[in-house]
């Protein structure tokens, strides 16, 4: 009644290990770490066999097969490289996830290294089995923006890719009689969100009620350079239109809004987000130079509001940009208080432009981003949104452009985008 001697499988062992096995003796076959028992094409942790009355074993000895983590999961906006030769995916093999640079960056500077574990899953020391996250890089155009020492009077043609966050927002409000069409600018904050001025997305009503235009009436163009050629641009419809709840049509306080795009846009050399600033009530420091781009600044004799309400016919063909200094708040307040009419420059606004006037004080599209280069993070940060200007012709002496102070709204923006600030740390100016 003695059963034949047993040979443990390669990379495996038999317990108990005895010189002889007799009727009713049982042995457990198991495998080394990183291997699985394979019997009749079925993987298991252990396999038990028994010495039978007739001196034979109840089953053949199974084999030990190395654990295979199989093909790793795809990473959105990322790539996978295999550290092991022949692209092995078996136990102790290593892979490395990386993000599509320079447009995406890995959250929390994770190494992206994953090892095939004994359990057959790809594991990272920090994230465990969770995949890393590739977040859009912000404020780093593929073309370097011009140095800010030389002053530019009036608009200058922007090269493609110079303002990759620039969005053209076209609103066609078919609920109005007669139908209304107007445009504005915005700034890409992530693959799915555009920051703009609330008055661009407010229905052009016959009263001062703040009601947003229907999302169906909004089209956003990204990666656009020349409005006559939209073929290379990405156009997207809106999934949501969010106006700041306290936006006031009478004084344009809280003139800020967001558009969520129907689908995330693919990032590339001509489509990249701008960075949001830190939450700080002071806003940009006086005399700092910023850049604003737009399609509506080619005509110095119309006001921003006239441009916004006159439809796309006042569009400049090619994206223009100007360089403007931030004006001390007190100086701007005084310049508007001296005018007839109710012009209040609130703490949610700042001014930019030149005392002596010139085209540069009348920037084209409402909602466009006033960006300042942050030396610390080496990124472009959206500090302002084109909001309003004085009643005189654009570029009049001592009529500064007024911008929404974005730094007062950082928390509101993150809240609307549904992202805790900690998750999007790379997006924040440091």
């Amino acid at each position: 009644n003695e059963c034949p001697e047993l040979q443990p499988p390669v990379h495996g062992k038999i317990e108990p290990s005895q010189a002889k096995y007799f009727f009713k003796d049982q042995v457990l076959v198991s495998c080394d770490t990183g291997y699985k028992v394979l019997k009749d094409n079925v993987e298991m942790d252990t396999f038990q066999i028994e010495c039978l009355k007739d001196g034979t074993w109840s089953n053949k000895i199974p084999t030990c097969k190395i654990v295979d983590c199989r093909a790793p999961g795809e990473l959105e906006h990322g790539l996978i490289t295999f550290s092991t030769r022949n692209n092995l995916t078996t136990y102790k093999s290593e892979i490395k996830y990386s993000c599509q640079e320079p447009y995406y960056k890995m959250l929390n500077n994770n190494t992206g290294i994953y090892t095939c574990s004994a359990q057959g899953v790809w594991m990272n020391k920090v994230l465990g089995r969770s995949l890393p996250t590739c977040l859009p890089e912000c404020g780093q155009p593929s073309r370097s923006l011009p140095s800010l020492v030389k002053r530019i009077i009036g608009g200058r043609n922007a090269e493609p890719g110079l303002f990759p966050w620039q969005a053209l927002i076209v609103v066609e409000d078919t609920s109005r009689v007669p139908n209304d069409k107007w445009f504005g600018s915005g700034a890409l904050l992530s693959a799915s969100w555009i920051l703009t001025a609330a008055h661009v997305l407010r229905s052009q009503r016959r009263d001062t009620t703040v009601i947003p235009v229907s999302k169906e009436h909004v089209t956003v163009y990204l990666g656009l350079h020349d409005v006559r050629d939209k073929s290379g641009a990405v156009n997207s419809s809106a999934a949501r239109v969010v106006l700041h709840p306290d936006f006031n049509i009478q004084n344009y306080n809280h003139d800020i809004a967001l558009v969520q795009l129907q689908e995330p846009v693919p990032l590339g050399p001509h489509v990249m987000p701008v960075c949001l600033p830190r939450l700080e009530p002071e806003g940009p420091a006086p005399h700092m130079l910023g850049l604003v781009a737009g399609w509506g600044i080619s005509n110095p004799n119309v006001t921003v509001d006239e441009i916004i309400s006159s439809g796309t016919r006042t569009l400049s063909d090619v994206l223009q940009y100007v360089k403007l200094p931030v004006v001390p708040h007190a100086e701007c307040k005084t310049s508007y208080e001296s005018r007839s009419g109710n012009y209040s420059v609130t703490e949610n606004m700042f001014c930019a432009g030149y005392y002596e006037g010139g085209k540069d004080t009348c920037l084209g599209d409402s909602g466009g981003a006033f960006v300042i280069f942050d030396d610390l993070s080496q990124r472009w940060v959206v500090q302002g949104l084109v909001s309003w200007g004085g009643p005189e012709e654009c570029g009049s002496k001592q009529v500064y452009g007024v911008y929404t102070k974005v730094s007062n709204y950082v928390d509101w923006v993150w809240e609307q985008m549904g992202l805790p600030q900690s998750v999007v740390e790379p997006q924040v100016e440091r």
Epitope: S175, R206, D207, T208, T209, I211, D305
Partner: antibody
Amino acid sequence: QVQLVQSGAEVKKPGASVKVSCKASGYTFTTDDINWVRQAPGQGLEWIGWIYPRDDRTKYNDKFKDKATLTVDTSSNTAYMELSSLRSEDTAVYYCSSLEDTYWGQGTLVTVSS
Amino acid sequence: DIVMTQSPDSLAVSLGERATINCKSSQSLLASRTRKNYLAWYQQKPGQPPKLLIYWASTRESGVPDRFSGSGSGTDFTLTISSLQAEDVAVYYCKQSYNLYTFGQGTKVEIK
């Protein structure tokens, strides 16, 4: 085409309540607010309040804050105005309007009489 | 609250003549940001709801005859019917929409 159809005339006793309806058709109900206006016999127009169906926001004339309650049912594209604690001076024609007063209902006469 | 005062209360004009109605608001209806005056004019005939004629003080509503025109800014506004027709006999109201809504008391226009 756009239409606002209001419910029929009502006769109520003082102290009672009445609910007037305004059914909208021919446009997207949630894209615009509904206004309510009243006109007492031989008198001028008085704005009561408005409601925005997309988010149920309401605004009232202070005079009608405790008198009128505005609601909407977006499933049936209908706006409602409920008037409470009726008095004889609430006797009037009540109008609803939409698309910024481009379209009006035909009016509902509410008569309050003991 | 903004108070709207119309003048005159009633007006009798010969057919084909000009009719002018004034409306004064207790505060400016000009919004400096949009550069619009939030004032509208309505026409109401007996047994009918009001009809919008003019908005933003001077913009004619679609389908309104061009004999109706609006003018003014700030606190003083005018509705002009350049050549009165028989079908223009009605009560005319101004309405501010700068801060909620307030109607004027109305001006009755009749044929002389």
